[in-house]
Structures are given as structure tokens and as C-alpha cells.
């Protein structure tokens, strides 16, 4: 089925130009002396988005990011020179790239930057209340940023600041070799993962850190780190990457005799995101790119959304996998990975696991110990040598919820919004790519709510140039999405119901949980508004069922039929442009001969070729004159988008017209034109103008001029016979909807 084959293409594909023209994107295109707008901190209370960039920290107004404040925080000449002397790139590396931006308390943020390969941190005052309008750097108080921000701007930090303590996963050295998970700030001694032990961390790249409660007792709270790292030798043949989830207890203060100032509760497990292959070999998406936690009613059990890409340079693909925290906990309570046997392979540990079980937080809940410093030596020894779990964490339903392998881009970021619709709750995913586009995807149940199907609603280009989307935040309060890249920051609404069209069917076909037909337009759906006229069908997107009683209404309020006249010359070619707004729609053409009511389906062949943009008619004949109707069919619903009247001029007329006397006085034309009716004379005069006019390149421009002149004449001579004006009647009616021959994206929003 052709329509089903189109299911994995975005229904709407909007270029940056179209996004701008329809006011669907606001962009901050960066400052000349800055870049790398990668570090986001959303503050819904103050209605601000804080963004860390190169040498700057910004505070954007969530309502409109064009309204912003900025702090300039560059490095000194000293630091810049030192960095340059170390052989680093003065523009790309020897600057202060902000990597950490966290809320420190009610009045301050904590920020850290690379400091030109000399990490540095400070506090930023933001005031008690939004109306304070304070945004200033505490330049009297700088702190060493080692173990908080990486030295190298190419590396990321996963950070989390809770109760005055900063948890960060980063590289702690100049060379970018000593990767660790740290806890700094606060009143306790800094704590980190074991150094120079590849069993703990093996060249990791940190993605994010999250606090997730384990029980109702805050003492059991854990911090989870998401990262990817090199698989340990023996774990995989050849060099491979594994996606990981790591845990540490919030109340871990290190060991007493061993693992002093090192984590004693660190454990990690592999995150699997794969699809079964034809030969029984799974295709793995191992390169974890981003993670989003969707909070549920139970704070202990958020849903984890992960974006993954393939490691292979040959096969490029992306996937989204969903994980449940109960599955994660099950793995952390399962067998530890242990190296044993003649081949020194990784096997599940079969021996006695010391008590209390390594990875358990010291608390009243699970008994016995008040502090990790009181843990028995055998627990510490075991924890040191068994940081990894044997079993991996599999995604919900054991497969990705979305895969993209047939495209020239890869996924980089994800945020998810839970939307209440007429028939239930839907998760809408906004996925950022490495080419500066955002995909809007909805998970729709097929037979059951467990068996989900992904519907790609829109693909939106949010930056002028292709650029990797490196940060995304979603404001539920503002119903806006904020996107970061090297080039700048973009803001777009989560829903733009009016772009789908002016008819119930179009609104229904969109399958956007945010939108519903309210009786007169496609608008934001609010579950609280109990109106029987609300029409919405996310599960099936079936307009025939939901809008059938409104068809008359639709015809009245729906898009008016676009009509055009096109002139073609016999034996030449002409192109009839018609492409529906929806990429899921099938285009269906009909032909109606002049003075006939009967419409026939156009058969494709050498003479008529169908393209994505429309119909190409080659070697025009007189019999091709007539009406061409372009229809869009989607989900059983058909809509007529365009009626083109084609007039074919025969070559005889044209040759006579072009063949001038030898002496070039054009007497033949005079002679020929004398036998014509007044309207014919006007028409031929206009046609000659087109042929001889050096500045009129296209039929369109010619027609435009005739149309303007015609209108002017009518204004000047009211009540007069209008001569050839009927010829251009359709043209006037459809002028706004006309497209240029060059197929630039200058069209008004198309129907369907």
C-alpha cells in the first residue's frame, strides 16, 4: 500500500523559510564573538532559559527569546595564551565554554566553564523573584573547576546540583583521559570514581545525571548517570561502544580504609537498544546521545527515553528506546559481572555476595548501616572489583519505539510531552537531529496501549544552516520548545494547530494530540473544555468517521479551490504544479476536456510524466487543452486542491505570428491581426510582447503584467466592455496562491 509506505515520512515537512514566514520559529542567531549554545537550564518559575555558550551566559525570556540578558565571562589573556601555547586552537578551544549551569539555591546559579583548558566555576546572582531582574556574575568568587567542567570544549559534563553538592561526570585532566564521576562543593570531602580502573569507567562520554528516589525515605535516594563508554576487553569482540546507566547513593561518603573518598555504591549496567536482524544477529544502537526522564505519578518510576545511534560508519541509523526504572532496579539487584575461566570471560558472579549488598544505600530502610564509612571491608573490596552488572537493561517491549535508518541525519536530542487527548494520554516526542531539524512524533497504540506505533507528524527546520542540535528543553508552562546548537537558540511552539488547514478533515488527518476541530477551526485541545463539537482522532486519523457530518461545513469553511490558467505552445512542454501540504497524501489527477462535463483519470506514459511536484506534459497537442484537476487522497479522504485550465496554442498561428517580412516591417502580422476580433488582437499583442520583451522571463511575469494592466484599465474605464479580461479572470482569483515556475518555496500554505 503506497499510503502505508509513506507512514515513516513526516506528514508535514517545513523548511526554515516556511517556519519563519508562518511565525512558527523565533531564532536567536548568536553573537559574533560567541558560539556553542549547548548548556541549558530551564527555570519555569522565573520564566527564563539560561544558556551557557562560548564566553557568555544568557538569560532568555521564555515567552520570546529575542528578549534576553547576557553575562560576558571570557578568559584572561594569560589563560588564553597558555592555552594557545599548549597547541590548542585559539578560537575553538582557547575560550571559556560554559559546560555546567545549575540552580545552586533560591538566588544563585552555579556555572562552570572550560576556561581555555583551565576549568573555572563561579556563582551567578539571579535574585529572589522574577521581577528582581537580576543577572550578574559574582566575579569576586571564582573556584577551581577541575572535576566539574572538562578542559576540552568538545567533551560534555553530565551535572546535577542537589542540596549544595555538585555531581558531575566529566574529564578531570588536560589530556582528557581521567574520566570520573565526582561529587564536589558542599561540606564533605570531594568523592570520585576509582582512578585508572577501566572496569569502573572506560573512556566514557557522559550524557546526563538525574536524582531518582528509591523509596519514600530520602536516605535511599540515588543519582543515576547516563553515559556511553568503550566496552571492556572480553565483553565484546573488537572495539565497541556500550550505552550505560550508572548509579550512586546520594549518601555515599566513601570507604574508611579502602575506597577512601571514592564511591562505594557505584554500579553500572548496559542499556540495550536493538532490533533483531535477519540472520539472528541484532542491530545494536549503542551510541547513547541523549536521555529524557518522563515523570509519572510515582516519582520513583519515571519513564526513561533514550536516543541512540549506530556505531558503524557504514550503516547509519538512529533509534529511540524506552526503559522502566523497575527494569533498571531489577538489573541492579541481579548478578554482578565477574571475570573468570580460562578465557577470562565475563560471567555472572556465582559466589557469596557480601552483606549489605554492594550498591545498597546505607539507611534504616534496608537495615544495619548508617554510613558507607561503616561498611565491612568485604563489601568495599567486592564493590571495588565488581562495578558492573552482568545483565543488561532491555527496553520496554524489548525493542525501540522508533527507528530511522533511511535518512541523511541522525538523532541527537529528545524531549517528551505527555498530552491529554480526547481518547487518552499520548506522549509526543520532539527529536533533534544533527542537521538542525526537529521531528515531532506521537506514540499511538495499535491494538493495545502496550503495542505502540510512532507517527511522524512534522519535520521542522529550525536553523538557517544545517547544524547539530545539541540541547533541547520543553516548557510545559509556556507550551514552547527551546533548541540549542553551535549557531544559536531557537524557540518554537509545541503546537500550531492552524497550520493543518481550515477544515475538520485536515485537522483530523493531522493526528496531533494537541489539536482538535472545535466546530469552526483547528485549535488547541483542552480536556477541561467539555464541548461536544470537539473532533479529534489520534489513534486512526480518520476524517470520514469524525468529520462526515461536517462535510458541508467543510466546503464552506475549508480552503477555496485554487484555479489557474496556463498557456502552452503546441509540441512544447508544460508543467502543472501541485504538491499537497501533507507528504502522506497521494496525488490523483483528472482531466476534463473543454466543453465536456466528464472527467477522466490521467494515465501516465511518455506523454504525461508524474513527479513529486506535479505533472509534466511533453509534446503538447491541441487535444491537451482543457481542465486538469489535482486531488489529494489521504486516509480515504479526497480533496481537490487545484484546477488548472490549459490553453494550447497551435504552431501554425505561432509561426505565422513569428514569421516577419524580409524587410522586417512586420506587415504579415499587421495583415493577420486585421482579420482578428478585438479580443484576439489584444491576446496576440500580449503574446508578441512576451516573445520580444527581454525583461519578461516567464509566462508568469508576462501574465502578471497583463493582469495588472487589465485591472488598471478597468479602474480607469468603469462600465466598459472588458475585452479580454475574462481570459484573466481565474488569474486574478488565484494570484495569491500562485507559484513561480522555478519551484522556490514561495507558495502560500498548501491545502491538505
Amino acid at each position: 500500500n503506497y499510503a502505508n509506505g509513506k507512514n515513516n515520512v513526516p506528514r508535514l515537512k517545513l523548511s526554515y523559510k516556511e517556519m519563519l514566514e508562518s511565525n512558527n520559529v523565533i531564532t536567536f542567531n548568536g553573537l559574533a564573538n560567541s558560539s556553542s549554545y549547548h548548556t541549558f537550564l530551564l527555570d519555569e518559575e522565573r520564566s527564563r532559559l539560561y544558556v551557557g555558550a562560548k564566553d557568555h551566559i544568557f538569560s532568555f525570556n521564555l515567552v520570546n527569546i529575542k528578549d534576553f540578558q547576557k553575562i560576558v565571562w571570557p578568559v584572561s589573556y594569560t589563560r588564553r595564551d597558555e592555552c594557545k601555547w599548549a597547541g590548542k586552537d585559539i578560537l575553538k578551544e582557547c575560550a571559556n565554554f560554559i559546560k555546567v549551569l545549575e540552580a545552586y539555591n533560591q538566588t544563585h546559579l552555579y556555572a562552570c566553564g572550560t576556561g581555555a583548558f583551565h576549568p573555572i566555576c563561579t556563582y551567578i546572582e539571579v535574585g529572589h523573584h522574577p521581577e528582581d531582574n537580576i543577572f550578574k556574575l559574582q566575579d569576586s568568587h571564582f573556584e577551581n573547576g577541575r572535576g566539574k567542567s572538562p578542559y576540552d570544549p568538545k567533551l560534555l559534563t553530565a551535572s546535577l546540583l542537589i542540596d549544595g553538592e555538585l555531581y558531575s561526570g566529566t574529564a578531570a585532566d588536560f589530556m582528557g583521559r581521567d574520566f570520573a564521576i565526582f561529587r564536589t562543593l558542599g561540606h564533605h570531602h570531594p568523592i570520585r570514581t576509582e582512578q585508572h580502573d577501566s572496569r569502573w569507567l572506560n573512556d566514557p562520554r557522559f550524557i546526563s545525571a538525574h536524582l531518582i528516589p528509591e523509596s519514600d525515605n530520602p536516605e535511599d535516594d540515588k543519582v543515576y548517570f547516563f553515559f556511553r563508554e568503550n566496552a571492556i576487553d572480553g565483553e565484546h569482540s573488537g572495539k565497541a561502544t556500550h550505552a550505560r546507566i550508572g548509579q550512586i547513593c546520594k549518601n555515599d561518603f566513601g570507604g574508611h580504609r579502602s575506597l577512601v573518598n571514592k564511591w562505594t555504591t557505584f554500579l553500572k549496567a548496559r542499556l540495550i537498544c536493538s532490533v533483531p536482524g535477519p540472520n539472528g544477529i541484532d542491530t545494536h544502537f549503542d551510541e547513547l546521545q541523549d536521555v529524557f526522564l518522563m515523570n509519572s505519578k510515582d516519582p520513583k518510576n519515571p519513564i526513561v527515553y533514550g536516543v541512540f545511534t549506530t556505531s558503524s560508519n557504514i550503516f547509519k541509523g538512529s533509534a529511540v528506546c524506552m526503559y522502566s526504572m523497575s527494569d533498571v532496579r531489577r538489573v541492579f539487584l541481579g548478578p554482578y559481572a565477574h571475570r573468570d575461566g580460562p578465557n577470562y570471560q565475563w560471567v555472572p558472579y556465582q559466589g557469596r555476595v557480601p552483606y549489605p549488598r554492594p550498591g545498597t544505600c546505607p539507611s534504616k530502610t534496608f537495615g544495619g548501616f548508617d554510613s558507607t564509612k561503616d561498611l565491612p571491608d568485604d563489601v568495599i573490596t567486592f564493590a571495588r572489583s565488581h562495578p558492573a552488572m552482568y545483565n543488561p537493561v532491555f527496553p520496554i517491549n524489548n525493542r525501540p519505539i522508533m527507528i530511522k535508518t533511511d535518512v541523511n541525519y541522525q538523532f541527537t536530542q529528545i524531549v517528551v510531552d505527555r498530552v491529554d487527548a480526547e481518547d487518552g494520554q499520548y506522549d509526543v516526542m520532539f527529536i533533534g537531529t544533527d542537521v538542525g531539524t526537529v521531528l515531532k512524533v506521537v506514540s499511538v497504540p495499535k491494538e493495545t496501549w502496550h503495542d505502540l506505533e510512532e507517527i511522524l507528524l512534522e519535520e521542522m527546520t529550525v536553523f538557517r544552516e544545517p547544524t547539530t542540535i545539541s540541547a533541547m528543553e520543553l516548557s510545559t508552562k509556556q507550551q514552547q520548545l527551546y533548541i540549542g546548537s553551535t549557531a544559536g537558540v531557537a524557540q518554537l511552539p509545541l503546537h500550531r494547530c492552524d497550520i493543518y488547514g481550515k477544515a475538520c478533515a485536515e485537522c483530523c488527518l493531522a493526528r496531533d494530540p494537541y489539536c482538535a476541530w472545535d466546530g469552526s477551526s483547528c485549535s488547541r485541545y483542552f480536556p477541561t473544555a467539555k464541548r461536544r463539537t470537539r473532533r479529534q482522532d489520534i489513534r486512526n486519523g480518520d476524517p470520514l468517521t469524525h468529520c462526515s457530518d461536517l462535510q458541508h461545513h467543510d466546503n464552506h469553511h475549508g480552503p477555496s479551490l485554487e484555479e489557474r490558467i496556463i498557456y502552452g505552445v503546441e509540441n512544447s512542454s508544460t508543467f502543472l504544479e501541485c504538491s499537497p501540504k501533507s507528504q502522506r497524501a497521494l496525488v490523483y489527477w483528472q482531466f476534463q476536456r473543454r466543453n465536456e462535463d466528464r472527467k477522466e483519470e490521467i494515465r501516465m506514459g511518455d506523454h504525461i510524466i508524474r513527479t513529486e511536484q506535479g505533472l509534466l506534459l511533453r509534446s503538447l497537442q491541441k487535444k491537451d487543452s482543457g481542465n486538469y484537476l489535482c486531488h489529494a487522497v489521504e486516509h480515504g479522504f479526497m480533496q481537490t486542491l487545484l484546477k488548472v485550465t490549459l490553453e494550447v496554442i497551435d504552431t501554425e498561428h505561432l509561426e505565422e505570428l513569428l514569421h516577419k517580412d524580409d524587410d522586417g516591417d512586420g506587415s504579415k502580422i499587421k495583415e493577420m491581426s486585421s482579420s482578428m476580433t478585438p479580443s484576439q488582437k489584444v491576446w496576440y499583442r500580449d503574446f508578441m510582447q512576451l516573445i520580444n520583451h527581454p525583461n519578461l522571463n516567464t509566462m508568469d511575469e508576462f501574465c502578471e503584467q497583463v493582469w495588472k494592466r487589465d485591472r488598471k484599465q478597468r479602474r480607469q474605464r468603469p462600465g466598459h466592455s472588458q475585452g479580454s479580461s475574462n481570459k484573466w479572470k481565474h488569474m486574478q482569483e488565484s494570484k495569491k496562491g500562485r507559484n513561480r515556475r522555478t519551484h522556490e518555496f514561495e507558495r502560500a500554505p498548501r491545502s491538505v
Epitope: S76, E82, W85, N144, R146, D173
Partner: antibody
């Protein structure tokens, strides 16, 4: 007041080794890159080596590469230069200098004489 | 042979203005900051000018630095007898990945 005090110089045979030290005070030592610069008797200044504030990176002049090793101990506020396979042309006053985009503070120097 | 070229000597009478030149290439002076160092007889060098033309605190404003293209110069106005010293220019050399000094200029106050 910034102070840099070199020690460890002296007379050594060709092919021998020597370890120079530089004790720093009056500034946050662990925050700055440090360097060694030498001056042969009656000659001009020659940069020898420099080390990043956290020892993360070390750089050497071609004339000493592979023979000299720069290091530092931030807990002791001390900079070191381990000199091996010494040659007659290494004879010079060795200055320890604080790096601040240039050499903004210098020690008084320690004389190293390599005799054949 | 030094990478940066300075005249071996310069002289002037008290109160006079003296200029010492330093020429290099695009890999050092052309693209990096120039510093000037003063070395009084029997003492360690002292930073006189940094970042082409800036004076550290404590250095009299009689000393000024400038740079044009791949050349730099140090000007001393109102010359005094205590200015008699060796003067070195220095800059980072990107192609050598090292710091380079001029051969030094011995300034004599007549």
C-alpha cells in the same frame, strides 16, 4: 609578594644528571603554568621548558627534548627540572619563571656547570 | 642565532629617547603578543612590557612598546643612567611551539 627560589645547581660531569628545584610563594602556585629559562654565560635568554598548572601538559625546547623532564608538586608549591645526559652546552644560569601569558616573575637563578 | 632579531647595542645620553627594534615573522611577532624584559647587570630578568604595549604596575611610563606587522619596538624616553641594562624581546612561536627571545640589546647611557 611573589618569590621564586631556585636550588640544585652545581658542577656536574658531561653525561651526568642534576635535579633543579624552584620553591614558590606569594601566589596560588597551583593556578599558574611555570617555566624554566636559561642563560649561558655572556649570552642571551633561552626558553627551556614549561608545564601546565596541573601538570596536564609539558613542553620542551628542541635542544633539551628527551633529556630534560619538567614536573611540579602543587601540594609543596615546588617546580622541578630533572636534567639527564648533560652536555657542555647546557652550562648556564637556570631561571624558574612564573608564566602569565609571558614570564611575569623570575627567580634569581641557579648556576649549572657541565665540565668535560 | 636567535629567532627574533635585535640590534646588539644601543646608546643615548640622559634625557634622550631611545628605540630598540625587534623583528620576527608571522609565526611569532605577527600573530602573537610581544613582551620586553629588562636585565640589569648581575640580576634576573624583569618583565617590562607585556601584550605588545602594556606596562605591569611599577614600570615607569617612560617605557612604551609598540608593534606593527612582524616587528616590534621598545621606546625609552627621558633616559636615565639606571636604565643601562640588557633588553630582550620575546614572543611565542606557533610553528616552533616554543617561546623565543631576541639576542638582546645592550643599552649604554653615555
Amino acid at each position: 609578594e611573589v618569590q621564586l627560589l631556585e636550588s640544585g645547581g652545581g658542577l656536574v660531569q658531561t653525561g651526568g644528571s642534576l635535579r633543579l628545584s624552584c620553591a614558590a610563594s606569594g601566589f596560588t602556585f597551583s593556578d599558574y603554568a611555570m617555566s624554566w629559562v636559561r642563560q649561558a654565560p655572556g649570552k642571551g635568554l633561552e626558553w627551556v621548558s614549561w608545564i601546565y598548572y596541573d601538570s596536564g601538559s609539558k613542553y620542551y625546547a628542541d635542544s633539551v627534548k628527551g633529556r630534560f623532564t619538567i614536573s611540579r608538586d602543587n601540594s609543596k608549591n615546588t617546580l622541578y627540572l630533572q636534567m639527564n645526559s648533560l652536555r657542555a652546552e647546557d652550562t648556564a644560569v637556570y631561571y624558574c619563571a612564573k608564566l602569565n601569558g609571558d614570564f611575569d616573575y623570575w627567580g634569581q637563578g641557579t648556576l649549572v656547570t657541565v665540565s668535560s | 642565532q636567535s629567532v627574533l632579531t635585535q640590534p646588539p647595542s644601543a646608546s643615548g645620553t640622559p634625557g634622550q629617547r631611545v628605540t630598540i627594534s625587534c623583528s620576527g615573522s608571522s609565526s611569532n611577532i605577527g600573530n602573537n603578543d610581544v613582551s620586553w624584559y629588562q636585565q640589569l647587570p648581575g640580576t634576573a630578568p624583569k618583565l617590562l612590557i607585556y601584550a605588545d604595549s602594556h606596562r605591569p604596575s611599577g614600570v615607569p611610563d617612560r617605557f612604551s612598546g609598540s608593534k606593527s606587522g612582524t616587528s616590534a619596538s621598545l621606546a625609552i624616553s627621558g633616559l636615565r643612567s639606571e636604565d643601562e641594562a640588557d633588553y630582550y624581546c620575546g614572543a611565542w612561536d606557533s610553528s616552533l611551539s616554543g617561546y623565543v627571545f631576541g639576542g638582546g640589546t645592550k643599552l649604554t647611557v653615555l
